[in-house]
Interface confidence: low
């Protein structure tokens, strides 16, 4: 939905948010294609692809924020994710190079869908914040206030380490979205229930 065309129906909005976060925690939509495209699919490499502790807010932290703080933190974190994804996309091979090397073009398309999907989620976050009458939550195009941002990655010594850093970041992102989904799943039937 475009900004300004927010649903006023809480359950519809919550359903959309839950559906979007369900999709975004699916590694086959982002992490797995990234691993294939970047040539990181050597045995057990996922063990080196674990997120760095503290890169994303934990589920425990998210649960303790209350609805307003949660949406604000989610919005800000996704803002950081958008910046990192833009950076990662610049380092990806181009479509014509993929075709020449026999790589699956669908993997690149999946990666390129990540940012539009996040923008859609941020729009619904904005709509939900409006519904909760939370004027503090930033619009989707801005980073929210009061949220800790995922740290800038350590400067990588070489191309492989940069790929690995991207891999760790995406692993953390999927884990974070899983936590987000669990928090949304605990939200009640009404915007007024358990409101802090």
């Amino acid at each position: 939905a475009a900004i300004g065309s927010c649903s006023k129906e809480y359950r519809v909005l919550l359903g959309q948010l839950q559906k979007q976060t369900d999709l975004m925690q699916d590694t086959s939509r982002l992490l797995d294609p990234y691993i294939r495209i970047q040539g990181l699919d050597v045995p057990k490499l996922r063990e080196h692809c674990r997120e760095r502790p503290g890169a994303f807010p934990s589920e425990e932290t998210l649960r303790g924020l209350g609805r307003r703080g949660f949406l604000q933190t989610l919005n800000a974190t996704l803002g950081c994710v958008l910046h990192r994804l833009a950076d990662l996309e610049q380092r990806l091979p181009k479509a014509q190079d993929l075709e020449r090397s026999g790589l699956n073009i669908e993997d690149l398309e999946k990666l390129q869908m990540a940012r539009p999907n996040i923008l859609g989620l941020r729009n619904n976050i904005y709509c939900m914040a409006q519904l909760l009458d939370n004027s503090d939550t930033a619009e989707p195009t801005k980073a929210g206030r009061g949220a800790s941002q995922p740290p800038t990655p350590t400067p990588a010594s070489d191309a492989f380490q940069r790929k690995l850093e991207g891999c760790r970041f995406l692993h953390g992102y999927h884990r974070f979205m899983h936590s987000v989904g669990r928090v949304f799943s605990k939200w009640g039937e009404s915007p007024n229930r358990s409101r802090r």
Partner: antibody, heavy 118, light 113 residues
Framework: EVQLVQSGAEVKKPGESLKISCKGS????????IGWVRQMPGKGLEWMGI????????RYSPSFQGQVTISADKSISTAYLQWSSLKASDTAMYYC???????????WGQGTLVTVSS | DIVMTQSPDSLAVSLGERATINCKSS????????????LAWYQQKPGQPPKLLIY???TRESGVPDRFSGSGSGTDFTLTISSLQAEDVAVYYC?????????FGQGTKVEIK
């Protein structure tokens, strides 16, 4: 600092058993593979096999399958290479090395010289 | 098994001159799924363990001087030392990790002329 420290040189007789060790430090021992590489006197490098200490998943080169056993004890960050019955042709320098799966080996132990002679 | 063949077996080069070592694999080590060449280069000095120089055919390991470079794709690869230094005297090995068992070339001995 990543380090792989191997046990000392061994002199054995044919038919004897032997277990040499490789202790890792300075990194998460259970998150990387440990490979073993043989170098016979004046010769090149031969890959023997690898183990993933996290779950003891082990892969052998067909040339060494059944000739040696690779194992690991993650509680003490140590990998092992053992023979149940040594032959004179086992005389060589044996290196352990850290790897990203069955791939390149980025850190190497100092080597253990095994001499088998009657 | 993939057979790795290096040439030449030995090489004598003057200090400051370029040294070139070739490595040929019996089948391609280029993964069509990710466009990476599964090839590494090692340096072994007398009495020392091997040291990783290059992986993914052309990525220099951290701390390796930039006079070392790797190139090539598919079945033909090259390690180049752009300006040979005294400390570069060693045996150099290529290694494929496209498939198990991992296999090494027989080695190329680099000496000073």
């Amino acid at each position: 600092e990543v380090q792989l420290v191997q046990s000392g040189a061994e002199v054995k007789k044919p038919g004897e058993s032997l277990k040499i060790s490789c202790k890792g430090s300075g990194y998460s021992f259970t998150s990387y593979w440990i490979g073993w590489v043989r170098q016979m006197p004046g010769k090149g490098l031969e890959w023997m096999g690898i183990i993933y200490p996290g779950d003891s998943d082990t892969r052998y080169s067909p040339s060494f399958q059944g000739q040696v056993t690779i194992s690991a004890d993650k509680s003490i960050s140590t990998a092992y290479l053992q023979w149940s019955s040594l032959k004179a042709s086992d005389t060589a320098m044996y290196y352990c090395a850290r790897g990203f799966g069955a791939s390149y080996l980025d850190y190497w132990g100092q080597g253990t010289l095994v001499t088998v002679s009657s | 098994d993939i057979v790795m063949t290096q040439s030449p077996d030995s090489l004598a080069v003057s200090l400051g001159e370029r040294a070139t070592i070739n490595c040929k694999s019996s089948q391609s080590v280029l993964a069509s799924s990710n466009n990476n060449n599964f090839l590494a280069w090692y340096q072994q000095k007398p009495g020392q363990p091997p040291k990783l120089l290059i992986y993914w055919a052309s990525t220099r390991e951290s701390g390796v001087p930039d006079r070392f470079s790797g190139s090539g794709s598919g079945t033909d690869f090259t390690l180049t030392i752009s300006s040979l230094q005294a400390e570069d005297v060693a045996v150099y090995y290529c290694q494929q990790y496209y498939s198990t068992p991992l296999t090494f070339g027989q080695g190329t001995k680099v000496e000073i002329k």
